[in-house]
C-alpha cells in the first residue's frame, strides 16, 4: 500500500541500525571516493530527517521519494565535480534520470588501495572503543570497492565480523583466533560479490525476464516439491528484491527480502522440508541461510519429462499461446529433476528446447521435427561434464597454485591483449574453483564449477568493457550470459596477436620480494608467467614449466642468501638469459 512518507515507512520497517547501515552502503556504492567521515555525516543527517518524518509524516519533504532525498544529499556534497568529474553532471538531471545516471557511473574497478586488515591488537582496540564506528568503516570499505554488493547480505557479513571480533578479542591469542575466521568471511563475501554482480549484469543487459528464468531454475532445483505456482511466486519476489538492490533501492530491497524470508518461513509446507533450521534464526542469518539452504529431497514419482514436452499433442499450441508459462514450466520440470546441473546449463537446455519448437512448430509434422529434442540435449550436457572432469583432475594433480598457473597460461593465450593484472586476477579467481568445488560430492561439482566460473567471467567482461582490447573477449562477452563460459572455454590461441618483445626489466626482481606475504609472492610470479606467455604465446607447457621452475629456484636461492641484494643483481640477469634461451 502507498505510504505518505516512504522514508518513514522504511525506517519503521527496518529499524534504526539496519536503516543506517543500508544508507551508508548506498552512499558508499554511489560515491566511491568519499571518506567514511563524509558519508557518516550524510547518513546521520538522513537518519535524523527520517526520524522527523516518523514523528510527523506530513512534515516538509517527507513525501519525497527516496531517490530524490538521497540524490539531493549526494548532489549537495562540496567539490563534487573536482572529485568525481562527469558524475557531477548527473546532478543537473531530474529523477528518475538522475538515479540512472548515478548507476551508470558506478565503477566496478575503483582505483582504491586494497582493503588492508589491521593487526589483531589494533583491530580489537578500535572495535572495543567504538563498535558502531568500526562496523561502519567495514561497510563503507567493502561497499565502495564492490558497488553492486547485495546490501542486506553485506549487513549479514558485518554481523559475522562483529561476532568474530567479540569472540576473538576476548582471547589471549587474538591473532590466531581472528585470522582464519576473518579469512573465511572475506572469501565468502568476495564470492557473494561476484555472484551478485552477475545477477545485476543479467538484469541490466537482458532484463527481468532473464533474471526470473535464472531464479526459476535455481529455486526449482532447491525446492523440487514446491509446485510451479509456488516457484513462480518466489521467483517473482526474488526478481523484485534483486532488481531493487541492483537499482540502488537498498531500503526497499532489504525490506522486501525480509518479507520474502517471512513468507517462506510461513509457507514451509508448500515450499520445502529443509527450511526450519533457517527459520529459527534472527533476520539477517535467516535470509542468508534460506539463500543457501540445501536441496529438498526430490519427489520419487516424477513422470518422464517427455510426456508433457514431447509426446503431448498440444506442445506447439501451448508454446505459441503462452511461451512464458509453457517454457517456464519446462524449465521448472527439468530443473527440479536435475539438482546436479548448473543453472547455466539448465538455461541453455531451455533455450535449445525453445529454439527447437520455434523451428519445428510451423512445419507440416511438428512432432517428427521436435521428437528428438531431448536426445539433442546430450552434447550440451556432456560439454560441461567433461570440463569439470578435466579441470578437477588437473586441480588434483597440480594443487591450487599450479592450477591457477595452468589457467593463466590458457587464458593469456586466448586473450593476450588483456592487461596482465586483469589476467592474473581472473586466473587466480578461476583457479579457486578447484578448492571450492572439486572436493564436493560428484553430483554437486557441475553446478558449483560452472556457476562460479560464469560469475568470474562476468567480472572479466565488465573489466574488458571499460577498455576493450581483445576481439576474442568482446565476442564471448557480447553473447548471452549463459553462453559465455562455453564461449571462453572454446577459445584457442589468438593467432592475430603479435608477440610482445622481450623486456629484461619485466623479469628483473629485487630482494624486497622475499619479505612479501605468500599471496603477493605468487602474484609476482604469476605476473611474470603471463608476461612470458605474451612474449611466446606458443611456448609449450614444458618450456614454461622449465622457466618457472628455474625462476622459483632463483627466488628460493636468493631469498636464503646472506647478501640478498647481490644475489638478485648477479643471478637475475643470468636467469633472464636462461629464460630467453629456454623459450627460443
Amino acid at each position: 500500500e502507498a505510504h505518505k512518507s516512504e522514508i518513514a515507512h522504511r525506517y519503521n520497517d527496518l529499524g534504526e541500525q539496519h536503516f543506517k547501515g543500508l544508507v551508508l552502503i548506498a552512499f558508499s556504492q554511489y560515491l566511491q571516493k568519499c571518506s567514511y567521515d563524509e558519508h557518516a555525516k550524510l547518513v546521520q543527517e538522513v537518519t535524523d530527517f527520517a526520524k522527523t518524518c516518523v514523528a510527523d509524516e506530513s512534515a516538509a519533504n517527507c513525501d519525497k521519494s527516496l531517490h530524490t532525498l538521497f540524490g539531493d544529499k549526494l548532489c549537495a556534497i562540496p567539490n563534487l565535480r573536482e572529485n568525481y568529474g562527469e558524475l557531477a553532471d548527473c546532478c543537473t538531471k531530474q529523477e528518475p534520470e538522475r538515479n540512472e545516471c548515478f548507476l551508470q557511473h558506478k565503477d566496478d574497478n575503483p582505483s582504491l588501495p586494497p582493503f588492508e586488515r589491521p593487526e589483531a591488537e589494533a583491530m580489537c582496540t578500535s572495535f572495543k572503543e567504538n563498535p558502531t564506528t568500526f562496523m561502519g568503516h567495514y561497510l563503507h570499505e567493502v561497499a565502495r570497492r564492490h558497488p553492486y554488493f547485495y546490501a542486506p547480505e553485506l549487513l549479514y557479513y558485518a554481523e559475522q565480523y562483529n561476532e568474530i571480533l567479540t569472540q576473538c578479542c576476548a582471547e589471549a591469542d587474538k591473532e590466531s583466533c581472528l585470522t582464519p575466521k576473518l579469512d573465511g568471511v572475506k572469501e565468502k563475501a568476495l564470492v557473494s560479490s561476484v555472484r551478485q554482480r552477475m545477477k545485476c549484469s543479467s538484469m541490466q543487459k537482458f532484463g527481468e525476464r532473464a533474471f526470473k528464468a535464472w531464479a526459476v531454475a535455481r529455486l526449482s532445483q532447491t525446492f523440487p516439491n514446491a509446485d510451479f505456482a509456488e516457484i513462480t511466486k518466489l521467483a517473482t519476489d526474488l526478481t523484485k528484491v534483486n532488481k531493487e538492490c541492483c537499482h540502488g533501492d537498498l531500503l526497499e530491497c532489504a525490506d522486501d527480502r525480509a518479507e520474502l524470508a517471512k513468507y517462506m518461513c510461513e509457507n514451509q509446507a508448500t515450499i520445502s522440508s529443509k527450511l526450519q533450521t533457517c527459520c529459527d534464526k534472527p533476520l539477517l542469518k535467516k535470509a542468508h541461510c534460506l539463500s543457501e539452504v540445501e536441496h529438498d529431497t526430490m519427489p520419487a514419482d516424477l513422470p518422464a519429462i517427455a510426456a508433457d514436452f514431447v509426446e503431448d499433442q498440444e506442445v506447439c499450441k501451448n508454446y505459441a499461446e503462452a511461451k512464458d508459462v509453457f517454457l517456464g514450466t519446462f524449465l521448472y520440470e527439468y530443473s527440479r529433476r536435475h539438482p546436479d546441473y548448473s543453472v547455466s546449463l539448465l538455461l541453455r537446455l531451455a533455450k535449445k528446447y525453445e529454439a527447437t519448437l520455434e523451428k519445428c512448430c510451423a512445419e507440416a509434422n511438428p512432432p517428427a521435427c521436435y521428437g528428438t529434442v531431448l536426445a539433442e540435449f546430450q552434447p550440451l550436457v556432456e560439454e560441461p561434464k567433461n570440463l569439470v572432469k578435466t579441470n578437477c583432475d588437473l586441480y588434483e594433480k597440480l594443487g591450487e597454485y599450479g592450477f591457477q598457473n595452468a589457467i593463466l597460461v590458457r587464458y593469456t593465450q586466448k586473450a593476450p591483449q588483456v592487461s596482465t593484472p586483469t589476467l592474473v586476477e581472473a586466473a587466480r579467481n578461476l583457479g579457486r574453483v578447484g578448492t571450492k568445488c572439486c572436493t564436493l560430492p560428484e553430483d554437486q561439482r557441475l553446478p558449483c564449477v560452472e556457476d562460479y566460473l560464469s560469475a568470474i567471467l562476468n567480472r572479466v567482461c565488465l573489466l574488458h568493457e571499460k577498455t576493450p582490447v581483445s576481439e576474442h573477449v568482446t565476442k564471448c562477452c557480447s553473447g548471452s550470459l549463459v553462453e559465455r563460459r562455453p564461449c571462453f572455454s572454446a577459445l584457442t590461441v589468438d593467432e592475430t596477436y603479435v608477440p610482445k618483445e622481450f623486456k629484461a626489466e619485466t623479469f628483473t626482481f629485487h630482494s624486497d620480494i622475499c619479505t612479501l606475504p605468500e599471496k603477493e609472492k605468487q602474484i609476482k610470479k604469476q605476473t611474470a608467467l603471463a608476461e612470458l606467455v605474451k612474449h611466446k604465446p606458443k611456448a609449450t607447457a614444458e618450456q614454461l614449466k622449465t622457466v618457472m621452475d628455474d625462476f622459483a629456484q632463483f627466488l628460493d636461492t636468493c631469498c636464503k642468501a646472506a647478501d640478498k641484494d647481490t644475489c638478485f643483481s648477479t643471478e637475475g640477469p643470468n636467469l633472464v638469459t636462461r629464460c630467453k634461451d629456454a623459450l627460443a
Epitope: 532484463g207 525476464r209 506447439c316 508454446y319 505459441a320 499461446e321 503462452a322 511461451k323 512464458d324 508459462v325 525453445e354 519448437l357 520455434e358 523451428k359 519445428c360 512448430c361 510451423a362 512445419e363 507440416a364 509434422n365 511438428p366
Partner: antibody, heavy 118, light 110 residues
Framework: QSLEESGGRLVTPGTPLTLTCTVS????????INWVRQAPGKGLEWIGI?????TTFYATWAKGRFTISRPSTTVDLEMTSLTTADTATYFC???????????????WGPGTLVTVSS | AAVLTQTPSPVSAAVGGTVTINCQSS???????LSWYQQKPGQPPKLLIY???KLTSGVPSRFKGSGSGTQFTLTISDVQCGDAATYYC???????????FGGGTKVVVK
C-alpha cells in the same frame, strides 16, 4: 516464388467475404502463411497465421470474426460481420522458414482491396 | 495487448545523412522477436531486419538494427533517395496472438 491475394471487392456492412491467397513456386505444406491488413493511409495490422500443419492463431482482436483455412494449394481468409472499419488492403505473407511465432514475413503478395461501405 | 510505439514521425533527412527511428515495446518483446519493414507507396512491405539486428540478405549494410527488451532502433546511414518510405517495426510476444506492428515512421529524403 510468389503470393497473390484475390477476392477483394466492395461489400456492404454485415456481408461475409472470403479472400484467397494463391501461392506459386512454394510448397504450402512447408510454410506458415499470415494475413495482414492495412487501412488506407494507416499502419499494418496482423490478423492471424496458419501453420503448415493447419493449426491457426489469430490476433486477440480478430478472434471470432476471421477464419483462416487451407483448402488445397491456397490459403483463405473468411471474414464475417464486416464493418466500415474493415476497409483495408489485405495482404498474405509467408513467415521466414525456421520460425513459427516470430513476426518475420519475407514474402508478401501485392494485396487486395476490400471496401466496406453502405 | 502489446503495443509498439514508433517515434518520430515523419522524419526528414538529407541525402548522405543519417536517420534514426525508435520503436518502444510494452511489454518486452519475446526473445528479441523484433523486425523492421520498409514500405513504399502502392507496394507491400519488405523485410529489412529480423531478431532486432540481423540483416535480411540483399539489404544494404547502411541499415542497422539495435536494441533489446523494450527499446529498439533502426538507423539508416548514408541515406539515399530510394530510402524514402514508411518504416514499420513488428514485434512478437509471449503469446503469438499479441503479434503487432508499430504505427510506422515516414522518412522523407531531401
Amino acid at each position: 516464388q510468389s503470393l497473390e491475394e484475390s477476392g477483394g471487392r466492395l461489400v456492404t456492412p454485415g456481408t461475409p467475404l472470403t479472400l484467397t491467397c494463391t501461392v506459386s513456386g512454394i510448397d504450402l505444406s512447408n510454410y506458415a502463411i499470415n494475413w495482414v491488413r492495412q487501412a488506407p493511409g494507416k499502419g499494418l495490422e496482423w490478423i492471424g497465421i496458419i501453420w503448415a500443419s493447419g493449426t491457426t492463431f489469430y490476433a486477440t482482436w480478430a478472434k471470432g470474426r476471421f477464419t483462416i483455412s487451407r483448402p488445397s494449394t491456397t490459403v483463405d481468409l473468411e471474414m464475417t460481420s464486416l464493418t466500415t472499419a474493415d476497409t483495408a488492403t489485405y495482404f498474405c505473407a509467408r513467415t521466414v522458414p525456421g520460425y513459427s511465432t516470430a513476426p518475420y514475413f519475407d514474402l508478401w503478395g501485392p494485396g487486395t482491396l476490400v471496401t466496406v461501405s453502405s | 495487448a502489446a503495443v509498439l510505439t514508433q517515434t518520430p514521425s515523419p522524419v526528414s533527412a538529407a541525402v548522405g545523412g543519417t536517420v534514426t527511428i525508435n520503436c518502444q515495446s510494452s511489454p518486452s518483446v519475446w526473445s528479441n522477436f523484433l523486425s523492421w519493414y520498409q514500405q513504399k507507396p502502392g507496394q507491400p512491405p519488405k523485410l529489412l531486419i529480423y531478431e532486432a539486428s540481423k540483416l535480411t540478405s540483399g539489404v544494404p549494410s547502411r541499415f542497422k538494427g539495435s536494441g533489446s527488451g523494450t527499446q529498439f532502433t533502426l538507423t539508416i546511414s548514408d541515406v539515399q533517395c530510394g530510402d524514402a518510405a514508411t518504416y514499420y517495426c513488428g514485434g512478437g510476444y509471449s503469446s503469438i496472438s499479441d503479434t503487432t506492428f508499430g504505427g510506422g515512421t515516414k522518412v522523407v529524403v531531401k
